[in-house]
C-alpha cells in the first residue's frame, strides 16, 4: 500500500432522511464488486486518507425512470459531488442535472487531501437505483 | 509489460446476428487509434489476461439518431457491460439506457481476473455508430 | 516528473470569436482546482509534452439550459475533442451531441505524442457554463 495506490469503488446503501440530500455508500467484497483500499467510509461518506490527485467518477441512475419521469417533477434532479468536510475545504467538484435522462455519469481529476470527506448530494424528489451496475461512486489516486 | 500496465481501447467492428445482443469489437494501430496491450480479443469480445482492478469505460452512440429517434422505438435501448465468461463469474458491471439521448458514456472501477471475457450487450432495435470517435470501449489496469 | 505522470485538469476560460468553435481553457491553483503538471497551454489549447497513452476526459454543461433549450435551437450542439495540430495528426478523438440534455461527459484512452495540441470544438449557438464543477477538461498519462 506504500505505493499510494489508494482506490475505492462504492455501491449505494441508502438515501438520507428527508432534509439530507446526501447519498450513503457502502463497500466491500461481501457486498459484491465494491471495495475500499486506502480510503474509508465515515457514516456512509467517503474519506480520503492520502494526499494526491484523484480521478473521481460517479454514475447515478434514477429508479423506475423513463424519459418523461424527470420532466414530470417540478424540481430539477441534480447530482453534485463535493468536499463537505472539513468545512474550510468545502467545495463542489462535479455537478450534473438529469434533465430528460435517467442516468448521469461523469469523472474528473481533482486534488484531494487526507481527511477530505466527499459527499454526493442528490437534490430533487426521485429515488436513485440501488442496482450495483446502475449506481456507483469511486475514486482512484493517480499521482502525488 | 511486467509492470502490469495492461490496457486496451477498441472500436466497433459490427453488431451480432439478430438474436445476439453483443457488440463485436476490433483493435489495432492499422485500424486507427485502437490498441490492445495485454488484453486480447476472442471473436470480438475482450478477454482479460492479468488479475487486478481495472477502470472500464465505454461510449456508444446510436446511428442516425436525434432526440426523437429513441422515443420512436418501443423497446428501450440499453447498454450493459458485464463479464459473460467464465459462466461462474457472469455479472453485469455497468448498465445505461439511452432514453431520449443518442449517446451513453460511463466508466467504473472493477476487479477482473485472468480469463474474464467482457461482453457489451446492446438491447433494443437501433444500430450503433461505427465512427471511432463516437463508439469505443476500453479497459485500463490500475492496481493489483 | 521523470516518472512521466503528466496530468492536467482545466477549467473553461472563454469561448472563441464567432467563427471559432474552440473552447479556450485555463489552469492553475490560483484559479481553483485546475492544474497543469507536464502538459502546457498554448493560447488556451492543451499541448502534450510527453508521448504515451492518455486518458482524456471532458464534461461540458450548457449555460441557462433546460431540456427544451437544446431542442429549441436548430443547429445541433455538438462537442468534439481532437488533435488539431500538427495538421498531419489532425483527428477527432471523441464526439458527443447534447440532444435534449444540457451536459455531456465522456472519457477515452488514446495515444498522444509530444507536440499534439488538443482542441475542444463546441458547435451550435449555445454558451457553455464556466462553473468549474460543470465544465472541465483533463488528460492523464497512463503508460508509455
Amino acid at each position: 500500500e506504500s505505493l499510494g495506490w489508494d482506490i475505492a469503488e462504492l455501491q449505494l446503501n441508502h438515501t438520507g432522511p428527508q432534509q439530507d440530500p446526501r447519498l450513503y455508500w457502502q463497500g466491500g467484497p461481501a457486498l459484491g464488486r465494491s471495495f475500499l483500499r486506502g480510503p474509508e467510509l465515515d457514516k456512509g461518506q467517503l474519506r480520503i486518507r492520502r494526499d494526491g490527485i484523484y480521478m473521481v467518477h460517479i454514475q447515478v441512475t434514477l429508479a423506475i425512470c423513463s424519459s418523461t419521469s424527470t420532466s414530470r417533477h417540478h424540481h430539477p434532479t441534480t447530482l453534485a459531488v463535493g468536499i463537505c468536510s472539513p468545512a474550510s475545504r468545502s467545495i463542489s467538484l462535479l455537478r450534473l442535472s438529469f434533465h430528460q435522462g435517467c442516468t448521469i455519469a461523469s469523472q474528473r481529476l481533482t486534488p484531494l487531501a487526507r481527511g477530505d470527506t466527499l459527499c454526493t448530494n442528490l437534490t430533487g424528489t426521485l429515488l436513485p437505483s440501488r442496482n450495483t451496475d446502475e449506481t456507483f461512486f469511486g475514486v482512484q489516486w493517480v499521482r502525488p | 509489460e511486467s509492470l502490469g500496465w495492461d490496457i486496451a481501447e477498441l472500436q466497433l467492428n459490427h453488431t451480432g446476428p439478430q438474436q445476439d445482443p453483443r457488440l463485436y469489437w476490433q483493435g489495432g494501430p492499422a485500424l486507427g487509434r485502437s490498441f490492445l496491450r495485454g488484453p486480447e480479443l476472442d471473436k470480438g469480445q475482450l478477454r482479460i489476461r492479468r488479475d487486478g482492478i481495472y477502470m472500464v469505460h465505454i461510449q456508444v452512440t446510436l446511428a442516425i439518431c436525434s432526440s426523437t429517434s429513441t422515443s420512436r422505438h418501443h423497446h428501450p435501448t440499453t447498454l450493459a457491460v458485464g463479464i459473460c465468461s467464465p459462466a461462474s463469474r457472469s455479472i453485469s458491471l455497468l448498465r445505461l439506457s439511452f432514453h431520449q439521448g443518442c449517446t451513453i458514456a460511463s466508466q467504473r472501477l472493477t476487479p477482473l481476473a485472468r480469463g474474464d471475457t467482457l461482453c457489451t450487450n446492446l438491447t433494443g432495435t437501433l444500430l450503433p455508430s461505427r465512427n471511432t470517435d463516437e463508439t469505443f470501449f476500453g479497459v485500463q489496469w490500475v492496481r493489483p | 516528473e521523470s516518472l512521466g505522470w503528466d496530468i492536467a485538469e482545466l477549467q473553461l476560460n472563454h469561448t472563441g470569436p464567432q467563427q471559432d468553435p474552440r473552447l479556450y481553457w485555463q489552469g492553475g491553483p490560483a484559479l481553483g482546482r485546475s492544474f497543469l503538471r507536464g502538459p502546457e497551454l498554448d493560447k488556451g489549447q492543451l499541448r502534450i509534452r510527453r508521448d504515451g497513452i492518455y486518458m482524456v476526459h471532458i464534461q461540458v454543461t450548457l449555460a441557462i439550459c433546460s431540456s427544451t433549450s437544446t431542442s429549441r435551437h436548430h443547429h445541433p450542439t455538438t462537442l468534439a475533442v481532437g488533435i488539431c495540430s500538427p495538421a498531419s495528426r489532425s483527428i477527432s478523438l471523441l464526439r458527443l451531441s447534447f440532444h435534449q440534455g444540457c451536459t455531456i461527459a465522456s472519457q477515452r484512452l488514446t495515444p498522444l505524442a509530444r507536440g499534439d495540441t488538443l482542441c475542444t470544438n463546441l458547435t451550435g449557438t449555445l454558451l457553455p457554463s464556466r462553473n468549474t464543477d460543470e465544465t472541465f477538461f483533463g488528460v492523464q498519462w497512463v503508460r508509455p
Partner: antibody
Framework: QVQLQQSGPGLVQPSQSLSITCTVS????????VHWVRQSPGKGLEWLGV???????DYNAAFISRLSISKDNSKSQVFFKMNSLQSDDIAIYYC??????????????WGQGTSVTVSS | DIVLTQSPASLAVSLGQRATISCRAS??????????MHWYQQKPGQPPKLLIY???NLESGVPARFSGSGSGTDFTLNIHPVEEEDAATYYC?????????FGAGTKLELK
C-alpha cells in the same frame, strides 16, 4: 413466416379517400416499424410514411396534409388512409416491414400491393 | 430531399457475364460509419425484394453473385455471373434521412 397481407378497394372516386389495411404475421408490430410506399409509371417508387413500433409516425412532407397511418398491435394491423385522391395518385400502394434495426430504414418484406385507380 | 440517379436506365447482358448498375446520390448518404444505401430487385407483377443493405451487406437468402459497393455519393450493384432469373428492374434507396427516396430504376435484360 413473415407476411404482410393488404386489403382495400382498388377503385376510388376523385376527391375521396383511400383506406388500406395491412395485416401482418410472423412478427410483432411492437418491435418492427411498417413503411408505406407507392409505385406509379410516372413517378416510380415514392416513400409515403412510416409507423414506428411505438405508434409514432413520420410522413413524407409532400403528403403530410392528407395522409394518416395508424395501427392496432393486438390485431397485427396497420391502417393507411390518404384523403383527396386525384388522378396523379393512381399507383400500386405497398406496405413493407422495416428490418430489425429501427434506424436502418430499409424494407425487407413487402405486401402484395394494392392497385389503386381514381375514377368516377 | 436526396435525389438518387441510376445509370444506365437499361442494359442487356449475356448469361454468365457481369452486370454493373450505378447509383449516384445528390449528397453523401454516409454517416455513423455506414453507407445508408440499399438495393432492391423487382420483377413484373411482384413487389420489390431487398438484395443489399448498408451498401454492401447481402440480405439473407440472396445469392452471393449479387454484391454492392461504394460510399459517400457513388454506389454500385454488381451481378456476376448473371443468370436468367436475374432479368428484372433494380432500384437503389437511401435512408440517410427522411424522406426516404428511390432511384428511377435500371432494367436488366438478357441478350
Amino acid at each position: 413466416q413473415v407476411q404482410l397481407q393488404q386489403s382495400g378497394p382498388g377503385l376510388v372516386q376523385p376527391s375521396q379517400s383511400l383506406s388500406i389495411t395491412c395485416t401482418v404475421s410472423g412478427f410483432s408490430l411492437t418491435t418492427y416499424a411498417v413503411h408505406w410506399v407507392r409505385q406509379s409509371p410516372g413517378k416510380g417508387l415514392e416513400w409515403l410514411g412510416v409507423i414506428w413500433s411505438t405508434g409514432i409516425t413520420d410522413y413524407n412532407a409532400a403528403f403530410i396534409s392528407r395522409l394518416s397511418i395508424s395501427k392496432d398491435n393486438s390485431k397485427s394491423q396497420v391502417f393507411f388512409k390518404m384523403n383527396s385522391l386525384q388522378s396523379d395518385d393512381i399507383a400500386i400502394y405497398y406496405c413493407a416491414r422495416n428490418p430489425y434495426y429501427g434506424n436502418l430504414n430499409a424494407m425487407d418484406y413487402w405486401g402484395q400491393g394494392t392497385s389503386v385507380t381514381v375514377s368516377s | 430531399d436526396i435525389v438518387l440517379t441510376q445509370s444506365p436506365a437499361s442494359l442487356a447482358v449475356s448469361l454468365g457475364q457481369r452486370a454493373t448498375i450505378s447509383c449516384r446520390a445528390s449528397k453523401s448518404v454516409d454517416t455513423s460509419g455506414y453507407s445508408f444505401m440499399h438495393w432492391y430487385q423487382q420483377k413484373p407483377g411482384q413487389p420489390p425484394k431487398l438484395l443489399i443493405y448498408l451498401a454492401s451487406n447481402l440480405e439473407s437468402g440472396v445469392p452471393a453473385r449479387f454484391s454492392g459497393s461504394g460510399s459517400g455519393t457513388d454506389f454500385t450493384l454488381n451481378i456476376h455471373p448473371v443468370e436468367e432469373e436475374d432479368a428484372a428492374t433494380y432500384y437503389c434507396q437511401h435512408s440517410r434521412e427522411l424522406p426516404l427516396t428511390f432511384g428511377a430504376g435500371t432494367k436488366l435484360e438478357l441478350k
